[in-house]
């Protein structure tokens, strides 16, 4: 995260990062207690899943191995569409006040709308800086007209944009797959943005969560 | 430091296939995309295709698509390109590229590898 | 596919001169275009990005401006160290990445 802050401790409990070993990978947010939703772009073989910490790395966290993902079937590698996946954890999580389900959205938050969108991806841009605390970013919900002014095609149409004007707030490497939460709701997932980051007027741009929710509950119902 | 380097040149015979390497150093080889750029003798450069190193997603040049075979090694931090049936018009100098940008999307090339001759001659 | 054109294949000049090399593309690309040089036997290195980001490290005499279809890279003030070829390439519509034909600029 460019220009955040340190998230309040357990905040966030349904953030996770996915690891690769002892790397941070991605993000993701935990919506059942043995499923993890990302970014399709985040598909590894297999994932070491970290909960209930906010350090990256804590020996007290939950650690869950994970070897089946399930990426939408309409993702492309080519326009980016659809870049949304299901992780299943091979055993289920122990909840608890530091690991909790997200609140997936009952409806789409119109533009305007406050977030906060975090991670544990680097807080400089082009030269990396990983933080080891769990970092906050919020935005703003910006409208997909004014965001094609600045993507033009490349903004699909199950795409959200998010950011603050003139600030150069934003997500970056390692954010990819985490949460944006909105009125307590996950409404989306990082997906891209321009490089470096932080570009003020560069928005975030998200996998609007709000338009996969028949498709997460049913590919959750088919794999239990 | 931060590099990719390739491994050394090649003499192939027409029909034959050719493997080339590129080894990342100095980064997180897992976090970014390696791509595949060529330049025939006296000529320009041409994208070839791409690998993520994470997911091993792979998009290739049409008019490689089905010669061309991109993988990679995360123990090692490599990549490999492979074309097979090899003509005489596939001799050039093949260059591995680092893809900069965050999640989904990248932009630019902004690490290359000192690049890998490959000749091919009967 | 994406067809960008580079103008002129090559041009010579002297040390001191004001140098400018076009791209075009068949259709918009935003900004999404990016300036490399290449000397013989070397890899091709990155100038500017976005059309108009100057890469860390490179001299500010190397400038891009452009937007949509048509782009410029300008050296404002040619050095014996920029006697190379250039390149544009696209990263609007991808895959593929396209490149445009390459400008040698040669000493006059």
């Known amino acids: 995260i460019i220009d955040g802050y340190k998230c309040k401790e357990g905040s966030h409990p349904w953030q996770v990062a996915l690891l690769k070993g002892n790397q941070l990978h991605c993000g993701g947010v935990l919506v059942d207690k043995y499923w993890v939703l990302t970014a399709a772009h985040c598909k590894m073989g297999q994932y070491q899943v970290q909960l209930g910490s906010d350090k990256i790395g804590d020996q007290s966290a939950q650690k869950i191995k994970a070897t089946k993902s399930f990426r939408h079937p309409g993702y492309s590698t080519k326009t980016h569409v659809n870049d949304i996946m299901l992780v299943r954890l091979d055993e289920p999580v122990k909840m608890s006040s530091k690991v909790e389900a997200v609140q997936l959205p009952e409806h789409c938050e119109p533009p305007g709308t406050s977030c906060t969108v975090s991670g544990w991806g680097t807080t400089t841009s082009p030269d990396v800086t990983f933080p080891s605390d769990l970092m906050c970013s919020d935005v703003k919900l910006i409208s997909s007209r004014e965001c094609k002014k600045v993507y033009k095609d490349l903004l699909g149409k199950t795409m959200l944009c998010a950011g603050i004007p003139d600030s150069k707030t934003n997500t970056c490497n390692g954010d990819s797959g985490g949460p944006l939460v909105c009125n307590d709701t996950l409404q989306g997932l990082v997906s891209w943005g321009t490089y470096p980051c932080g570009q003020p007027n560069d928005p975030g741009v998200y996998t609007q969560v709000c338009k996969y929710k028949r498709w997460v509950m049913e590919t959750m119902k088919t794999h239990r | 430091q931060v590099q990719l380097v390739q491994s050394g040149a090649e003499v192939k015979k027409p029909g034959a296939s050719v493997k080339v390497s590129c080894k990342a150093s100095?980064?997180?080889?897992?976090?970014?995309?390696i791509h595949w750029v060529r330049q025939a003798p006296g000529q320009g450069l041409e994208w070839m295709g791409s690998?993520?190193?994470?997911?091993?997603?792979?998009n290739y040049a049409q008019k490689l698509q089905g010669r061309v075979t991109m993988t990679t090694d995360t123990s090692t931090s490599t990549a490999y390109m492979e074309l097979r049936s090899l003509r005489s018009d596939d001799t050039a100098v093949y260059y591995c590229a680092r893809a900069a940008g965050y999640g989904a999307r990248h932009w630019y090339f902004d690490l290359w590898g000192q690049g890998t001759m490959v000749t091919v001659s009967s | 596919d994406i067809q960008m054109t580079q103008s002129p294949s090559s041009l010579s000049a002297s040390v001191g001169d004001r140098v400018t090399i076009t791209c075009r593309a068949s259709?918009?690309?935003?900004?999404?275009l990016n300036w490399y040089q290449q000397k013989p036997g070397k890899a091709p290195k990155l100038l500017i990005y976005?059309?108009?980001s100057l890469q860390s490290g490179v001299p500010s005499r190397f400038s891009g401006s452009g937007s949509g279809t048509d782009f410029t890279l300008t050296i404002s003030s040619l050095q014996p160290e920029d006697f190379a070829t250039y390149y544009c390439d696209q990263w609007y519509s991808t895959p593929p990445i396209t490149f445009g034909g390459g400008t040698k600029v040669e000493i006059k």
């Open positions: 259709q918009s690309i935003s900004s999404y």
């Open positions: 976005g059309a108009s």
């Open positions: 690998i993520s190193a994470s997911s091993g997603d792979t």
């Open positions: 100095g980064y997180t080889f897992t976090s970014e995309g």
